[in-house]
């Protein structure tokens, strides 16, 4: 049995992969902040998790997704206040009993030291010193992600 | 209702720098960008650039060289400051709101003379 | 850069009668997240300029709906449905596609 979150973010990833492929992106847009080979954007307003996850999704983009420590902890350095919280793309999985990226793998445990609990609708937030698990109810600022097409040595056949 | 009010010394001298502060009120500068945009007596808009809430800038090319924009929350100020000016720096500098491509609110303006 | 040219240079107008603005870029303003940020500006002599327009298309709030925009791509439109005495002045369009640019400014004037 998914959760509604949990069907929301399967329909945004599958509407997402439905769209026309469009060319890859090799600086970030104006308005976006390069963070290695990222470009983000971090809201201005506020939203529950889900209209976060679909806003980054018209935006064509999706929710923050962070590989490991040293991607939280870059993603944190950019933060300056420390009262702002950001929803990322991580969210509790009540029928596997797990979180759970919109991409669809599971949270290492080793990645993210997570404060509070792990249940249903539960949603995950940064901050700049600390990762939260919030209700996905709760309307606070997120961050869309981009990721920057790596710029490759392309060998052309004669045409 | 958000107001935003230009101050800085409205004369400076050829090779010195331009240092002006935008005070913000009726909001916080802990949203959205916050934009320098500038207008030489009697002709059109030239962006300067703009500061991020999170801290982060982005100037215009043309003058990315000479162009710091860095912003105090604890004031809700922001500051432009551009070094080297010449004559063609001479403009009325406004401060605005950026919300992603809409300037949405101006200060009055202040008129800055590039003078010896 | 992204370049702007609108036009005409300057509308003299009849009040109650219509007026339009065209602007012109140099290349799509179709933002990399879908959005085309092309906004009107209008600069009443001796005043800071004032959004109109944002989005093409939408009116900022306060702004009569006697103003309306149109377009896409690279060719947009600002129409003052009934011009009246107090829309005199400069109007800007401006991108922010790329770092933003604005038009050379069209002067609405009253015949």
């Known amino acids: 049995q998914k959760s509604s979150i949990e069907k929301c973010s399967v329909d945004i990833q599958q509407s997402r992969n439905k769209t026309t492929e469009r060319p890859g992106l090799l600086n970030c847009p104006i308005y976006w902040q390069q963070l290695r080979e990222k470009c983000l954007l971090f809201s201005h307003t506020v939203n529950p998790w889900n209209n976060s996850l679909a806003d980054c999704s018209t935006k064509e983009s999706s929710l923050l997704l962070i590989r490991d420590k040293d991607e939280l902890i870059h993603t944190q350095n950019l933060i300056r206040d420390k009262a702002i919280l950001f929803w990322i793309g991580l969210n509790f999985s009540l029928s596997e009993k797990n979180w759970k990226w919109i991409n669809g793998s599971f949270l290492n445990s080793n990645d993210l030291e997570i404060r509070g609990d792990a249940k249903e609708n539960s949603c995950i937030s940064i901050s700049q010193t600390s990762v939260y698990s919030e209700y996905c109810s709760t309307e606070i600022r997120w961050i869309c992600q981009k990721e920057l097409t790596p710029v490759r040595n392309k060998v052309y056949p004669d045409s | 209702q958000v107001q935003l009010q230009e101050s800085g010394p409205g004369l400076v001298k050829p090779s010195e720098t331009l240092s002006l502060t935008c005070t913000v009120s009726?909001?916080?500068?802990?949203?959205?960008?916050w934009s320098w945009i500038r207008q030489p007596p009697g002709k059109g808009l030239e962006w300067i650039g703009y500061?991020?809430?999170?801290?982060?800038?982005n100037y215009n090319p043309s003058l990315k060289s000479r162009v710091t924009i860095s912003g105090d929350t604890s004031k809700n100020q922001f500051s432009l400051k551009l070094t080297s000016v010449t004559a063609a720096d001479t403009a009325v500098y406004y401060c605005?709101?950026?919300?992603?491509?809409?300037?949405?609110?101006w200060g009055q303006g202040t008129l800055v003379t590039v003078s010896s | 850069d992204i370049v702007m040219t609108q036009t005409p240079l300057s509308s003299p107008v009849t009040l109650g009668q219509p007026a339009s603005i065209s602007c012109r870029s140099s290349?799509?303003?179709?933002?990399?997240?879908?959005?085309?940020?092309l906004s009107w500006l209008q600069q009443r002599p001796g005043q800071p300029p004032r959004l109109l327009i944002y989005?093409?298309?939408n009116r900022f709030s306060g702004v009569p709906d006697r103003f309306s925009g149109s377009g896409a791509g690279t060719d947009f439109t600002l129409i003052i449905s009934r011009v009246e005495a107090e829309d005199v002045g400069v109007y800007y369009c401006?991108?922010?596609?790329?770092?933003?640019?604005f038009g050379g400014g069209t002067k609405v004037e009253i015949k």
């Open positions: 401006m991108q922010a596609a790329q770092f933003p640019t």
């Open positions: 290349q799509s303003l179709v933002h990399s997240d879908g959005n085309t940020y």
């Open positions: 605005a709101r950026d919300r992603m491509g809409a300037l949405d609110y």
């Open positions: 989005k093409i298309s």
């Open positions: 009726g909001g916080s500068i802990s949203s959205y960008y």
């Open positions: 500061i991020y809430y999170i801290g982060s800038t």
